[in-house]
């Protein structure tokens, strides 16, 4: 049988341990006489049989430590895990995700108010009371907010003719408010009357081309936490109501806008002020910000572009798409159904990836099926618990510096698990043959470190 | 591995002018001097009444390294009637694209607007200027009677440009026909001979142009990027164009016949919103004398080992085969949000091994997002997937990322040492950098043993 520990001629402890998780290094001074130093590297059982005492063998074990005290998480446990890894080794632990029965819900309506949406805007007037009544079954504390968007207010997306720059619809059949990138109209409030008033005041706007600046507005709504009023403890729902596709990051080169979106909040007096100087966010960037900010998106789409958004869903974890009927008649039911679907899906993703550390996560669903962690479980109820079997592997020790923790994040949840990674890449007894000195660390006395007095 | 990174020639332009947004070499036939051409689309000019008209600068590579603006157009806006301008040159982005071929320079302003003659509008038709030796003419093929969004009113002609071997220009206008986009090609000789400063809409007899299609093709952006190469074996350059929003944003690349603008071949991206077709290039990378196609998708997301999507960018390498079809491989970027594939520059045979090489930029990669350019070598099987050299941007961000590598041009030996050189633009810090290739020394070691 192949023994890579003994056959690889490892001349130092660190090199020996890097060969594989089964390798050990004997530090006993009298272990070899006249032989090669590499004989010190072997499988532990071989080292013992060759006369190395057990406490003289460098063989860092894999530890998974889950602190039991100070657990503050209620939905994602454990909230913290410490793992000691050595090259080639893997550690295992279970993560539990337990959805609550009723969440507080923050629902922010982000509405495309371009001219083609004229039919759907009217329906918003009757959203408030009906929706809050329906949501009372699923939420213990429901709040609504509202914002509008059109597109970047530059050529070629809007007409820059002086007579039309503030009313794209002059010369048309519509009365339109000035075009805008994104306006935050109403912060999240439990005052439904206030919401209905804000919606009732909303006028249609307009631009020239078909795609709109939805991703710009979504990113701002996600990251401008204090402006919107997103609560930490609430399920955060961003409802994007539109009938057209969205502009992509690099579309704005047509307008001479070539500075990548910085992903930060840029609202001044509730208006997105960097709309005309920064690109639309890319899908990857938008996805990252939505997940970071625990935002679940509901695309409520009227017309044939519904399928465009539906096809985007695999690229935007934690999003859902529903089709609005003519004049948005089914809008409230769509929201309720989407919310039920979103809270019944539990999937996780690894954030803050640590270089050289690999995660393999398998979801064990309430029905007993197993799925990849990113796919997760569907149809989870508040009585259910989803288990995630997490395997953490460190392939080799060639990474220096960088982050020493990763985060496992259930998508749309406001709790995470922090995984501290300790790399056992060096030996407690290094191979320096210098003059003996006192051992600094009292835990490794001369029984192990033969250099010590 | 043989680009000299220790002593590149650095050129800088006016701050905030986006100097370096477009770059090319300029090797006039009559002169022994050689130049760099650098677009600065937000530069202020001496044109009366014009704000940020944009300019193209000519930089002497050898001695002074000074850059002088080329005067293509010294005039302000022409008037249709009193207090009614015919055109709007402020913020027109002149210099957003620039290409040269021998004595010819074509430079464009894709955000040039005009009022139209029929009704008072303000439409971004785009315009270009062509300099051929001492003669400078305007070339605005989208400034036509076919106005409005459903015509050529929003064409933005000159958004992308190239020259063919046979002295045609190829121009991309991504906004024609409700942003279906359009390719237009005209003969240099006819552009020059037909020019009349008093005629706003010039008709060219030998023009090749794509036409409007059904509305389902709206918002595709044909003409966003262009390149040329022979793809049907007739010895005439065909037209390659990125169409990044086509196929419901999967993105496509179309190849049209350079003789008659008929469709030859299409490539389709595999992921929505990856911006497949943002950049295109054509060069024979595997030494079989067939031009190969390189397509950038800078927003492509790759699924990592943990299943998480990460935006790394991707370049598709499609090798043209004798049978006329293509064999495609994919090359993913190395860093998240670096936008690998934003620019692709054929380099010629950089290391003189008989195979052409290529540069691929990730303008937001590297330390502090300073930008990275990867050099990949060609070989008989295609592209070597491991970069042979990595050029790193050395300039810290000012008010925006440096964007080192956003524009690149290679395949020209400016220092006449037999090895082609590379220009890299970094418009965010108003720089253009010339990397010269050093000769490759091949050492042949031999051992002869003479038994006694």
């Amino acid at each position: 049988e192949d023994n890579r520990c003994a056959s690889s001629n490892a001349a130092s402890c660190a090199r020996c341990l890097a060969l594989g998780p089964e390798c050990g290094w004997c530090v006993q001074e009298d272990f070899i006489s006249g032989g090669s130093r590499s004989e010190r590297c072997d499988i532990v059982s071989n080292l013992i049989s060759k006369g190395c005492s057990v406490d003289s063998i460098e063989y860092p074990s894999v530890h998974v430590i889950i602190p039991t005290e100070n657990e503050i998480n209620t939905q994602v446990t454990p909230g913290e895990v410490s793992i000691q890894l050595r090259p080639g080794a893997e550690a295992n632990f279970m993560l539990k995700v337990h959805p609550l029965k009723k969440y507080p819900v923050d629902l922010y309506y982000l509405v495309d108010v371009s001219a083609s949406m004229h039919n759907n805007i009217e329906k918003l007037n009757s959203v408030g009371n009906d929706l809050s009544r329906k949501m009372a079954f699923f939420s213990r504390d429901f709040r609504l907010g509202f914002g509008s968007y059109v597109d970047k207010t530059v050529s070629p997306y809007i007409s820059i003719h002086p007579e039309r720059i503030h009313n794209q619809c002059s010369d048309y059949n519509l009365d339109c408010m000035p075009p805008h990138g994104y306006i935050h109209v109403l912060s999240l409030t439990e005052n439904i009357t206030e919401f209905e008033k804000a919606v009732h005041r909303q006028k249609i706007s307009g631009n020239i081309d078909t795609p709109e600046g939805g991703f710009d507005a979504m990113l701002q709504a996600a990251v401008c936490e204090s402006h919107i009023g997103w609560r930490k403890e609430a399920k955060r729902l961003l409802l994007v109501m539109t009938d057209q596709t969205s502009h992509l990051a690099l579309d704005s080169k047509l307008a001479g806008i070539v500075v990548p979106n910085d992903g930060n909040c840029h609202l001044k007096n509730n208006v997105y002020v960097k709309s005309t100087t920064m690109e639309h966010p890319s899908l990857g960037q938008l996805s990252e910000k939505l997940i970071d900010n625990n935002i679940n998106v509901i695309f409520a789409v009227q017309g044939k572009q519904f399928h465009w958004y539906k096809d985007l869903l695999p690229l935007l974890p934690g999003t859902i798409a529903g089709e609005i009927e003519s004049k948005a008649a089914n809008l409230n039911n769509l929201v309720v159904e989407a919310y039920q679907k979103l809270i019944s899906e539990v999937k996780v993703q690894v954030e803050n990836q640590v270089q050289g550390i690999y995660f393999n996560i398998t979801a064990i669903c309430p029905d007993g099926s197993r799925k990849p962690g990113m796919e997760g479980c569907r149809n989870v109820t508040s009585n259910d618990e989803v288990l995630f079997n997490v395997t953490v592997t460190m392939k080799k020790c060639d990474v220096t510096g960088g982050k020493n923790y990763a985060i496992i994040k259930p998508i749309g949840f406001n709790e995470t698990a922090k995984i501290h990674i300790h790399r056992n890449c060096s030996c407690q007894c290094e191979d320096n043959r210098g003059p003996k000195g006192k051992c600094v660390d009292e835990t490794f006395l001369d029984s192990k470190c033969f250099q010590c007095d | 591995f043989n680009l000299d990174v220790d002593s590149p020639a650095e050129y800088s332009g006016p701050e905030g002018s986006y100097f370096g947004f477009a770059v090319d070499f300029f090797v006039p036939s009559a002169s022994s001097r050689m130049f760099l051409l650098v677009g600065a689309p937000k530069a202020n000019t001496t044109q009366p009444g014009i704000v940020e008209g944009g300019q193209v600068l000519k930089c002497d590579w050898s001695s002074t390294r000074r850059c002088q603006p080329i005067e293509f157009d010294a005039t302000g806006n022409r008037d249709y009637a009193k207090d009614d301008p015919l055109e709007f040159k402020s913020h027109q982005w002149f210099g957003a694209s620039v290409r040269s071929k021998q004595d010819k320079i074509l430079a464009c302003a894709p955000l040039y607007h005009w009022r139209t003659e029929m009704k008072q509008e303000r439409e971004p038709v785009g315009t270009c200027f062509l300099q051929d030796g001492t003669k400078t003419v305007e070339y605005a093929p989208c400034r036509s009677q076919d106005i409005d969004a459903d015509g050529q009113g929003f064409c933005q002609g000159g958004f992308s440009i190239d020259f063919t071997k046979a002295d045609r220009v190829l121009l991309g206008g991504p906004g024609s026909f409700y942003w279906q986009g359009q390719l237009i090609s005209d003969q240099v000789a006819e552009i020059v001979s037909k020019y009349d400063p008093n005629v706003y809409s010039i008709k060219y007899n030998n023009q090749l142009a794509t036409r409007t299609a059904q509305a389902i093709f709206d918002d595709s952006y044909l003409g966003y990027s262009v390149a040329v190469g022979d793809f049907n074996g007739d010895g005439i350059d065909d037209f390659v164009s990125g169409v990044p929003r086509a196929a419901r944003t999967l993105g496509m690349v179309y190849i049209y016949d350079g003789k008659n603008m008929s469709s030859l071949y299409n490539f389709t991206g595999e992921q929505m919103a990856a911006y497949f077709g943002f950049s295109v290039a054509a060069t024979d990378i595997n030494g079989d004398d067939y031009a190969d196609v390189f397509i950038g998708a800078p927003l492509f997301m790759d699924r990592g080992s943990d299943g998480k999507l990460q935006e790394v960018g991707q370049v598709s390498v499609s090798l043209q085969r004798a049978s006329g079809d293509f064999q495609t491989t994919k090359l993913n970027g190395f860093e998240v949000f670096a936008r690998f594939g934003s620019a692709i520059a054929p380099l010629g045979d950089l290391d003189q091994d008989g195979f052409n090489d290529i540069a691929i930029a990730a303008p937001y990669g590297g330390e502090d997002k300073k930008g990275i350019v990867y050099i990949f070598n060609g070989r008989s099987t295609g592209l070597n997937a491991v970069p042979s050299q990595i050029l790193e941007g050395q300039w810290a961000a000012r008010s925006m990322p440096p964007s080192f590598g956003y524009s690149m041009k290679g395949a020209t030996d400016i220092d006449k040492n037999g090895y082609p050189d590379l220009i890299v633009g970094a418009f965010g810090v108003d720089r253009a950098i010339l990397y010269r290739a050093r000769p490759v020394i091949t050492v042949n070691a031999g051992l002869e043993v003479y038994p006694s």
């Epitope: 083609s116 009217e122 010369d171 059949n173 009365d175 631009n207 020239i208 081309d209 | 459903d150 015509g151």
Partner: antibody, heavy 127, light 107 residues
Framework: EVQLVESGGGLVQPGGSLRLSCAAS????????MSWVRQAPGKGLEWVSA????????YYADSVKGRFTISRDNSKNTLYLQMNSLRAEDTAVYYC????????????????????WGQGTLVTVSS | DIQMTQSPSSLSASVGDRVTITCRAS??????LAWYQQKPGKAPKLLIY???SLQSGVPSRFSGSGSGTDFTLTISSLQPEDFATYYC?????????FGQGTKVEIK
């Protein structure tokens, strides 16, 4: 069902005035631009005037500019055409029509297409 | 103003015939053209808009084509209820203008 009913037509002397009304029902009146189109006896159709949904923008044919005024009362779902300084050539059947909000290729709807028309009211200008 | 010219000004046809009416604009109007049908003593009825889009509720035997300056209305198989006057109208720019009409009569 969309209904448009014109009234106010009749015989008037040259130089006189008349006010036409159009009562609308079956749709959200304030969301639609409205037009007046006329047809002289035995002749073709001629567009006269139009008004946007809120009443903020008005448009007139050169032949009636300065003499006719279009207005609307959205609370009453009614469109008006005040006709002053009437001439013999203004004799026609006057139709009130709803401007359709039909999709175009871009964001803005099509202009000046009328999808519903009233039955018309006859205005005769004669001495 | 843009002038619209229809031809012929009248035509006679039988039930089942294929009928074609043309309309020419004095300048390019892209595809911004509508067709209306009017029966004696009645209000006009919208048939086609944007040159070729069929208004909902209009039978599919009606079709429109053309772009720029030349447009066509085709009735693929004339029915008894189709005998009427047909008007084209440009909806490209203000003021919208109509053609003089084409009367389709029973042969």
């Amino acid at each position: 069902e969309v209904q448009l009913v014109e009234s106010g037509g009749g015989l008037v002397q040259p130089g006189g005035s008349l006010r036409l009304s159009c009562a609308a029902s079956g749709f959200t009146f304030s969301s639609y631009a409205m037009s007046w189109v006329r047809q002289a006896p035995g002749k073709g159709l001629e567009w006269v005037s139009a008004i946007s949904g809120s009443g903020g923008s008005t448009y007139y044919a050169d032949s009636v500019k300065g003499r006719f005024t279009i207005s609307r009362d959205n609370s009453k779902n009614t469109l008006y055409l005040q006709m002053n300084s009437l001439r013999a050539e203004d004799t026609a059947v006057y139709y009130c029509a709803r401007s359709a909000l039909l999709p175009s290729r871009g964001d803005l709807p099509l202009r000046w297409v009328s999808d519903y028309w009233g039955q018309g009211t006859l205005v005769t200008v004669s001495s | 103003d843009i002038q619209m010219t229809q031809s012929p000004s009248s035509l006679s046809a039988s039930v089942g015939d294929r009928v074609t009416i043309t309309c020419r604009a004095s300048q390019g109007i892209s595809s911004y053209l509508a067709w209306y049908q009017q029966k004696p003593g009645k209000a006009p009825k919208l048939l086609i808009y944007a040159a070729s889009s069929l208004q909902s509720g209009v039978p599919s035997r009606f079709s429109g084509s053309g772009s720029g300056t030349d447009f066509t209305l085709t009735i693929s198989s004339l029915q008894p209820e189709d005998f009427a006057t047909y008007y084209c109208q440009q909806h490209y720019t203000t003021p919208p203008t109509f053609g003089q009409g084409t009367k389709v009569e029973i042969k």
